[in-house]
C-alpha cells in the first residue's frame, strides 16, 4: 500500500471525521467481511459534528483486515496514549486505512494541535495545499499554496507542515500563514515558486 505524503491541513479537510481517541486493545476481525475493528475511546471531536448528527461518540475504528488491503496496524500498546485520527464516515462508522493521518497527539507540534482544533477548517473548500515533490514545480492557481517540505527537508515533516496553514488572504488568494506558536529555527519562504 503506497501512501502519498499528506500535509496535516489536507488530511483535516479531506476527512469526514477528525477526533482525539485512545486505542483500547487488539483488533477484532469481523466475520464474513474484509474488515477488522479497533475499540477506541473518543476523548474529543475536532471535525464531523454535522456529519454524525445525534451520534455522541465512536466506539470502534474500522480498517481493512490485512496490511495488503491497506489496513491500519496499531503498534502502540499504551492504552492511555491519545491519538489524532482523521478518517472517513462510512455507514455511520469511523473508517481508517494505512494511509490515514493517525498520529500520537503529543507528536504534533503545538501549532498543529492548535490548527486541528480551530485553524485548518478555515482553509477547507477554499484553499489547496499543492505538493511539490520534484523541481521544477509551480502554482496552478491562486487558491493553491506550494508545499515544499519534501524538497527542502527531504520529508513531509517540515516547517510548512509543522507551523503553517494554507488560508484565504482574500476571496481569490490563499497564502501560507504562520500559526503563531513560537519556533526555534528560521523559516523558509512561506510561499514561493520552486
Amino acid at each position: 500500500c503506497s501512501c502519498a505524503p499528506t500535509h496535516p491541513q489536507t488530511a483535516f479537510c479531506n476527512s469526514d471525521l477528525v477526533i482525539r481517541a485512545k486505542f483500547m486493545g487488539s483488533p477484532e476481525i469481523i466475520e464474513t467481511t474484509l474488515y477488522q475493528r479497533y475499540e477506541i475511546k473518543m476523548t474529543k471531536m475536532l471535525k464531523g459534528f454535522d456529519a454524525v448528527g445525534n451520534a455522541t461518540g465512536f466506539r470502534f475504528a474500522y480498517t481493512p483486515a490485512m496490511e495488503s488491503l491497506c489496513g491500519y496496524v496499531h503498534k502502540s500498546q499504551n492504552r492511555s496514549e491519545e491519538f489524532l485520527i482523521a478518517g472517513r464516515l462510512r455507514n455511520g462508522n469511523l473508517h481508517i486505512t494505512a494511509c490515514s493521518f493517525l498520529v500520537p497527539w503529543h507528536n504534533l507540534s503545538p501549532a498543529q494541535q492548535k490548527a486541528f482544533v480551530k485553524t485548518y477548517s478555515a482553509g477547507c473548500g477554499v484553499c489547496t495545499v499543492f505538493p511539490c515533490s520534484a523541481i521544477p514545480c509551480k502554482l496552478e492557481s491562486d487558491s493553491h499554496c506550494l508545499w515544499t517540505d519534501q524538497i527542502l527537508m527531504g520529508s513531509e515533516k517540515g516547517y510548512q507542515s509543522d507551523h503553517f496553514a494554507c488560508l484565504p488572504r482574500n476571496p481569490d488568494l490563499c497564502t501560507w500563514q504562520y500559526l503563531g506558536v513560537s519556533m526555534t529555527r528560521s523559516l523558509p519562504l512561506a510561499k514561493a515558486e520552486a
Partner: antibody, heavy 120, light 108 residues
Framework: QVQLVQSGAEVKKPGESLKISCKGS????????IGWVRQMPGKGLEWMGI????????RYSPSFQGQVTISADKSISTAYLQWSSLKASDTAMYYC?????????????WGQGTLVTVSS | DIALTQPASVSGSPGQSITISCTGT?????????VSWYQQHPGKAPKLMIY???NRPSGVSNRFSGSKSGNTASLTISGLQAEDEADYYC????????FGGGTKLTVL
C-alpha cells in the same frame, strides 16, 4: 499495459469439475489482490472472493464459501477459480478483476470474462 | 442484509444529462455512501468509471461525474451520447463487498 487475460469458454455437464484461469501482465502480479465476480445470464454482478497471489491469502463471500476454490500460481502470474462438482445454476459469465486497495476497495482492471455453461 | 439499491432503468436523449442513484441500506445517522461505478456494455466486461465517490480513472470522459449526499451516491452523465447506452453498477466494500443491482441506461 496492465491486463488480465482469461481462459476460453467452457461447456460442462452437471457433476463435472472445472478450473478456469486468469493471467495477469503489465504489473507486479504478487502485489495486488485478484477478485472473481459472477454474472448470471441477464443478472447483475456478484463478488465471489479475492486472493493475494503474493502469499495466497484468500477471502470468500459468504454466498460462495465452500462452493468454489480460488487459488493462484505466482510463478506464472495466474489466478484460478475452480469447482469440484458443477451444477446447472453455475452457468454464468465469470470475470477476474484486479483489486485496488486505496482509499477504498474497488476493481480497476477486468479480464474479458469466461462463459461457463453447465447443461446435461 | 447489506444492499445497494439502484433504479432498474433510466433514459435520456442525446445531449441531455441523467443521474443514476445508489442508496445504501444503512439507517445510521451520517452513513456516507462511498462507492465506485462501473459501466458494462452488452457482451463486454465491466469498466471502472468512478472510484472514491468522484474520482475518474485516466481515459474516462469528464462527462462522467460522481457525488454523494448522505447515504446516497450518484453518477451523473452529461452531454449524453449513444455510446453511453449500457448497464451501470455501483459498488461498495464496507462493511461487505457488494454491487448494486444495476441500472440500464437507454439513450433515446
Amino acid at each position: 499495459q496492465v491486463q488480465l487475460v482469461q481462459s476460453g469458454a467452457e461447456v460442462k455437464k452437471p457433476g463435472e469439475s472445472l478450473k478456469i484461469s486468469c493471467k495477469g501482465s503489465g504489473y507486479s502480479f504478487t502485489s495486488y489482490w485478484i477478485g472473481w465476480v459472477r454474472q448470471m445470464p441477464g443478472k447483475g454482478l456478484e463478488w465471489m472472493g479475492i486472493i493475494y497471489p503474493g502469499d495466497s491469502d484468500t477471502r470468500y463471500s459468504p454466498s460462495f464459501q465452500g462452493q468454489v476454490t480460488i487459488s493462484a500460481d505466482k510463478s506464472i502470474s495466474t489466478a484460478y477459480l475452480q469447482w469440484s462438482s458443477l451444477k446447472a445454476s453455475d452457468t454464468a459469465m465469470y470475470y477476474c478483476a484486479r483489486l485496488f486497495t486505496y482509499p477504498f476497495l474497488y476493481f480497476d482492471v477486468w479480464g474479458q470474462g469466461t462463459l461457463v455453461t453447465v447443461s446435461s | 442484509d447489506i444492499a445497494l439499491t439502484q433504479p432498474a432503468s433510466v433514459s435520456g436523449s442525446p445531449g441531455q444529462s441523467i443521474t443514476i442513484s445508489c442508496t445504501g441500506t444503512s439507517s445510521d445517522v451520517g452513513g456516507y455512501n462511498y462507492v465506485s461505478w462501473y459501466q458494462q456494455h452488452p457482451g463486454k466486461a465491466p469498466k471502472l468509471m468512478i472510484y472514491d465517490v468522484s474520482n475518474r480513472p485516466s481515459g474516462v470522459s469528464n462527462r462522467f461525474s460522481g457525488s454523494k449526499s448522505g447515504n446516497t451516491a450518484s453518477l451523473t452523465i452529461s452531454g449524453l451520447q449513444a455510446e453511453d447506452e449500457a448497464d451501470y453498477y455501483c459498488q461498495s466494500d464496507f462493511p461487505v463487498m457488494v454491487f448494486g443491482g444495476g441500472t440500464k441506461l437507454t439513450v433515446l
